[in-house]
C-alpha cells in the first residue's frame, strides 16, 4: 500500500469579501485512521481553522459528509470571508493516538481576498485661499485588497498631474489604504469647479469610485470696488454708488465713510449671482452737498469674509452753494427712500436675485 498523500490541488484561491471560500483537500488512502485538521499558516503560531475530531467552527462546513464511508474528501467551505482571512491554509492528516499526532500536511492553498476600497474621501484646506494660490487636497480610501490600485485626480474633468500617492502598508497585509495629495492652482473662475479623486481597483469591475470636493468650499474671490458719482437727482443732492463686483463667498459688510467718519454700515443681503458663481452688489449714498462747505471725501470700505477691509474713495467737489435753512448740520438725508442698496447688474449677470 502506498503511503497516504494529502492533496491540495489549488495553489491559490481568490475570493471576494463577503463570499464563501472553498478550500479543496483530498487524501489518497484510508490509512492511517485519524482526523483531518485545517490550519492557517505553518509552524508553532499556526491558527486552527477546523478540526474534524473536536471543536466548534461556526464559519466552517465540510463539503463532503465526514461520516460517509470511505470518505477521502476533506474540503471545507469558510463563510463570510473578510480580508483578515487571507493567508495560506494547510490541510493536515493526523494519526489516531493518545493524543492524535500529525502525520502529513498538504502543500497549502493561498487564500487572497478581494476587498473593495471604501468610497474616497476628499478634503481640502482648512482655510480659504484666493486665486493664483496653490492649495492641497487629500484623498483617502481604505480596506482594499489586493494592493494594486490606481488613483487619478481631475479638476472639472481635466486630469491633474501634480500629486503624490502612497499605499500603506508597504509590506504584506490583509488590506491596504491609499492616501494621495494633489496641488491645485485656484483661478477666479473656480467657484463652480470640482476636484475629483477617482480610484480604480480590480474589485470594482471597471466602475471606479469617486470622491469630490467643491472648490466653493475652498476659494475666496475678493471683490473689486468702484465708486461713482451719479447725476444730481435733486437740487443739493448727489447719489454716490459703490459697486462691489465678483466676490465669493457672499459674506460681506460695507461701511460708508464721509471724511473718515462712519456714515453707515450694511451687510450684503440681496445680491446678484454671476455665471461664474461670484456675486455682485451695489450700495448707494445720498449726500446733501449744501451741508458741506468743503469738498467731501467719500470712502466705500468693504470687509469680505472676515478679511482685512479694502476701500475705494471718491472726492466729491462741493461748489459754493447758498445755505438752505434747516440743513446746515445735515451732510446726509436720512429719509428711507434716499439711502440704501441696490442690485448692480454686471455684464455676465444671471438676471436673478439671491435673498439670503
Amino acid at each position: 500500500e502506498e503511503e497516504l498523500q494529502v492533496i491540495q490541488p489549488d495553489k491559490s484561491v481568490s475570493v471576494a469579501a463577503g463570499e464563501s471560500a472553498i478550500l479543496h483537500c483530498t487524501v489518497t488512502s484510508l490509512i492511517p485512521v485519524g482526523p483531518i485538521q485545517w490550519f492557517r499558516g505553518a509552524g508553532p503560531a499556526r491558527e486552527l481553522i477546523y478540526n474534524q475530531k473536536e471543536g466548534h467552527f461556526p464559519r466552517v462546513t465540510t463539503v463532503s459528509e465526514s461520516t460517509k464511508r470511505e470518505n477521502m474528501d476533506f474540503s471545507i467551505s469558510i463563510s463570510n470571508i473578510t480580508p483578515a482571512d487571507a493567508g495560506t491554509y494547510y490541510c493536515v492528516k493526523f494519526r489516531k493516538g493518545s493524543p492524535d499526532t500529525e502525520f502529513k500536511s498538504g502543500a497549502g492553498t493561498e487564500l487572497s481576498v478581494r476587498a473593495k476600497p471604501s468610497a474616497p474621501v476628499v478634503s481640502g484646506p482648512a482655510a480659504r485661499a484666493t486665486p493664483q494660490h496653490t492649495v492641497s487636497f487629500t484623498c483617502e480610501s481604505h480596506g482594499f485588497s489586493p494592493r494594486d490600485i490606481t488613483l487619478k485626480w481631475f479638476k472639472n474633468g481635466n486630469e491633474l498631474s501634480d500629486f503624490q500617492t502612497n499605499v500603506d502598508p508597504v509590506g504584506e497585509s490583509v488590506s491596504y489604504s491609499i492616501h494621495s495629495t494633489a496641488k491645485v492652482v485656484l483661478t477666479r473662475e473656480d467657484v463652480h469647479s470640482q476636484v475629483i479623486c477617482e480610484v480604480a481597483h480590480v474589485t470594482l469591475q471597471g466602475d471606479p469610485l469617486r470622491g469630490t470636493a467643491n472648490l466653493s468650499e475652498t476659494i475666496r474671490v475678493p471683490p473689486t470696488l468702484e465708486v461713482t458719482q451719479q447725476p444730481v437727482r435733486a437740487e443739493n443732492q448727489v447719489n454716490v454708488t459703490c459697486q462691489v463686483r465678483k466676490f465669493y463667498p457672499q459674506r460681506l459688510q460695507l461701511t460708508w465713510l464721509e471724511n473718515g467718519n462712519v456714515s453707515r454700515t450694511e451687510t450684503a443681503s440681496t445680491v446678484t449671482e454671476n455665471k461664474d458663481g461670484t456675486y455682485n452688489w451695489m450700495s448707494w449714498l445720498l449726500v446733501n452737498v449744501s451741508a458741506h462747505r468743503d469738498d467731501v471725501k467719500l470712502t466705500c470700505q468693504v470687509e469680505h469674509d472676515g478679511q482685512p477691509a479694502v476701500s475705494k474713495s471718491h472726492d466729491l467737489k462741493v461748489s459754493a452753494h447758498p445755505k438752505e435753512q434747516g440743513s446746515n448740520t445735515a451732510a446726509e438725508n436720512t429719509g428711507s427712500n434716499e439711502r440704501g442698496s441696490s442690485d448692480y447688474k454686471d455684464d455676465d449677470d444671471k438676471h436673478h436675485h439671491h435673498h439670503h
Epitope: L30, P35, S66, T67, R69, E70, K96
Partner: antibody
Framework: QVQLQQPGTELVRPGASVKLSCKAS????????INWVKQRPGQGLEWIAM????????HYNQIFKDKATLTVDKSSNTAYMQLSSLTSGDSAVYYC????????????WGRGTSVTVSS | DIVLTQSPASLAVSLGQRATISCRAS??????????IFWYQQKPGQPPKLLIY???NLDSGVPARFSGSGSGTDFTLNIHPVEEEDAATYYC????????FGGGTKLEIK
Amino acid sequence: QVQLQQPGTELVRPGASVKLSCKASGYTFTNYWINWVKQRPGQGLEWIAMIDPSDSETHYNQIFKDKATLTVDKSSNTAYMQLSSLTSGDSAVYYCAMDYGSLYAMDYWGRGTSVTVSS
Amino acid sequence: DIVLTQSPASLAVSLGQRATISCRASKSVSSSGYNYIFWYQQKPGQPPKLLIYLASNLDSGVPARFSGSGSGTDFTLNIHPVEEEDAATYYCQHSRELPTFGGGTKLEIK
C-alpha cells in the same frame, strides 16, 4: 480524549422496555458513527446497529430490527438505544462504540451496560 | 450477510511462541483495494479493544508483536512472541457490508 460513558447496570421486567444511554465526550459527536454491540454472558460479540449523529441515519442488523431503536440527542452528545419487549434472551452487556475512521469499525468503546431481564 | 468463521475456537501457546488465529469470510471483504477486516482483543470484564484495522494496519498503541495479513476471504492474526498479558479472546470483524463479528478465539498462555 475520547470517552463513551454508559451506566453500569439496568434491571428490567420481562415485557418492559429499557433505554440505554451512551454519553460521548472528547470529540465532535456529530462527526462519527456510533455502533451498538451485544454480548451475552460467556458468548461472542453481536453487532446490533449504527447511527450517524449528524443526521440520525441508521443501519440495523436485521436480527435486531424489531428489538432495538437508535436515537441521539445532539444537545447533550448522547446516543440512545431503546430495547423493547424484553425477554431473558435480552439479558446481556450492551456496548456503544465509536467509529473513528468511517470504516464501520469500532475504535473506542464504552464500558458497557449490563441489562438483566428478570421478574 | 457475510459470515466470518474463526479458527480455532481456542488455543494454548507457550510464552514466547507464535499464536496464529484464522478468520475466513463467506465472500470477499475487499473493496477499492482495501480489505475490510478488523481484529479486536477482549479481556474478561472489559470492552473489546481494536488491534488491527483494514487487515494489516496496527492501531495506535498496539505492540508490534501483533500483526495481521490476508486478502479477499482469508485473514490471519499473528502474535509473536506471545506474552502473558496477551491471554484474551480475539474477534475478527468485517465491514464490507454491514458489520458482523467472527465467533471468537480464546488464547491461553502455557
